[in-house]
């Protein structure tokens, strides 16, 4: 808390400008009206205030908006956003994607902070669902964003938003998350032809059931081993040797290198040795 002192003669700020960087904390407190700060918020980010000075400005804004900042202020916070606590952000109502982008830009290159997580949560809750534009924005800033959501939260993603998802966005997703995303992806890409469909659906196959894998095996898709290893074990086990051979195509030889790892290990143990021998890979059931 800055001590209350009268503003020295001639130092009363009439504009938010560069001259304020030379003000001591107590002078900023005494000489910059909160009302002035509120009207000229867009200038704050263009001025290289110290963290201590930003503390004073934040204190003034907090006092001005006890129920939370309005979006007209939030969109101009810039580096002042880094001073906000999750508790501050929970009071906000952010509806504009441009505001969200502006604040994510401030945090760019850093891990997702509790402040950013709270901001995104407020934004998505305000919108009611993770629409395509929002998902595009969030995954651009945080490729792992989608996989940070719970299955319950992912259920609010409309199928149309799946078009915004890139393979790398799903790298850290676990099977429970893919279980939610796969049916949405299947719905989103249902009108694509075979090869194009497989390219799009491939990243989501960790949530695919057995019958869908069987169907894919009839389409000469040549699934790579990395994708196969991410499939649900319970979905792979019922597949026959012939179906796995068709599913993998020329990549079937890779099974030998993965024979000790799930789901390959468990699948091998379920097959008749005679069938495995037809692959000519020396797999032992």
């Amino acid at each position: 808390e800055v001590e209350k002192t009268a503003c020295p003669s001639g130092k009363k700020a009439r504009e938010i400008d560069e001259s304020l960087i030379f003000y001591k904390k107590w002078e900023l407190e005494a000489c910059v009206d909160a009302a002035l700060l509120a009207t000229q918020m867009d200038r704050v980010n263009a001025i290289p205030f110290t963290y201590e000075q930003l503390d004073v400005l934040k204190h003034k804004l907090d006092e001005l908006y006890p129920q939370g900042y309005p979006e007209s202020v939030i969109q101009h916070l810039g580096y002042l956003f880094l001073k906000m606590s999750p508790e501050d952000i929970r009071k906000w109502n952010v509806t504009s994607l441009e505001t969200l982008k502006a604040l994510l830009e401030v945090n760019k290159g850093h891990e997702m902070s509790p402040q950013v997580a709270t901001l995104i949560d407020r934004f998505v809750k305000g919108r009611g669902q993770l629409d395509k534009d929002t998902l595009d924005t969030l995954t651009a800033f945080y490729p792992g964003y989608l996989c940070s959501l719970s299955p319950e939260e992912l259920s609010s993603v409309p199928p149309s938003s799946i078009w915004a998802v890139r393979p790398q966005d799903l790298d850290t997703c676990d099977p429970r998350q893919l279980d939610v995303l796969y049916p949405k992806a299947r719905l989103a890409f249902q009108n694509m032809n075979g090869s194009e469909y497989f390219v799009k659906i491939q990243s989501f196959l960790g949530g695919a059931p057995t019958e869908d894998l069987k169907a894919l095996s009839q389409q000469n898709v040549s699934m790579d081993l990395a994708t196969f290893m991410k499939l649900r074990t319970d979905a792979v086990l019922p597949l026959t040797v012939a179906e796995v051979q068709k599913l993998l195509g020329p990549h079937v030889e890779g099974l030998k290198a993965e024979e000790r790892h799930r789901p390959v290990r468990d699948w091998i143990l379920r097959q008749r040795q005679d069938d495995l021998d037809t692959l000519g890979l020396g797999l032992q059931g």
Partner: antibody, heavy 119, light 114 residues
């Protein structure tokens, strides 16, 4: 001395629109939001809306959305309020008021503009 | 919106008497982070515009005589005039500025001089 000088009284017909002005002097016009307040029957005060003279941003009381439009002319340090589709309910005294330095109280008021809507 | 209720709606007192008027809000105007109450008092003399008397519930605006005192916290506030003068004949309004930007005024207390 900080002053807000408002335009004179108006007699207007129902259905018409009109514009009230409020000229600010004695302070930095772009440093303080300008507010408008309605006083009906010489008693009730109602906040209509505010405008940020620096960037033209506005915020309205839900009740007055579509009834009042706030604008500013920075070059002349003047705020305006246009009242649309006037009815007898709009007969009142309208004040412009500058927001206080540290929060949203009103430290300087104009003298008021009396608007009478009558055929 | 926060509803502001003032009482009494009018009162008549003699010069030199003490006056207390009340203002109640439908929700608390106290912000715990700064321990300030977001309430202002205005005086409106006949034929004039309102004039700021008190802000932050108890801070006198410069130039306001010290016979005017604001007090209270949370939802209950009072304006006290310690010794009424004839020039204090006016309507007194309270205003909350806690809920940006939907600020609301009380219905006013009319002070008459006997």
């Amino acid at each position: 001395e900080v002053q807000l000088q408002q335009s004179g009284p108006e007699l207007v017909k129902p259905g018409a629109s009109m514009k009230i002005s409020c000229k600010a002097s004695g302070y930095s016009f772009t440093g303080y939001t300008m507010n408008w307040v309605k006083q009906s029957h010489g008693k009730n005060l109602e906040w209509i809306g505010l405008i940020n003279p620096y960037n033209g941003g506005t915020s309205y009381n839900q009740k007055f959305k579509g009834k009042a439009t706030l604008t500013v002319d920075k070059s002349s340090s003047t705020a305006y309020m246009e009242l649309l589709s006037l009815t007898s309910e709009d007969s009142a005294v309208y004040y412009c008021a500058r927001v206080g330095g540290s929060s949203w109280y009103f430290d300087v008021w104009g003298a008021g503009t009396t608007v009478t809507v009558s055929s | 919106d926060i509803v502001m209720t003032q009482s009494p709606s009018s009162l008549a007192v003699s010069v030199g008497e003490k006056v207390i008027m009340s203002c109640k809000s439908s929700q608390s105007l106290l912000y715990s982070s700064n321990q300030k109450n977001y309430l202002a008092w205005y005086q409106q003399k006949p034929g004039q515009s309102p004039k700021l008397l008190i802000y932050w519930a108890s801070t006198r605006e410069s130039g306001v005589p010290d016979r005017f005192t604001g007090s209270g916290s949370g939802t209950d506030f009072t304006l006290t005039i310690s010794s009424v003068k004839a020039e204090d004949l006016a309507v007194y309004y309270c205003q909350q500025y806690y809920s940006y930007p939907t600020w609301t005024f009380g219905g006013g207390t009319k002070l008459e001089i006997k």
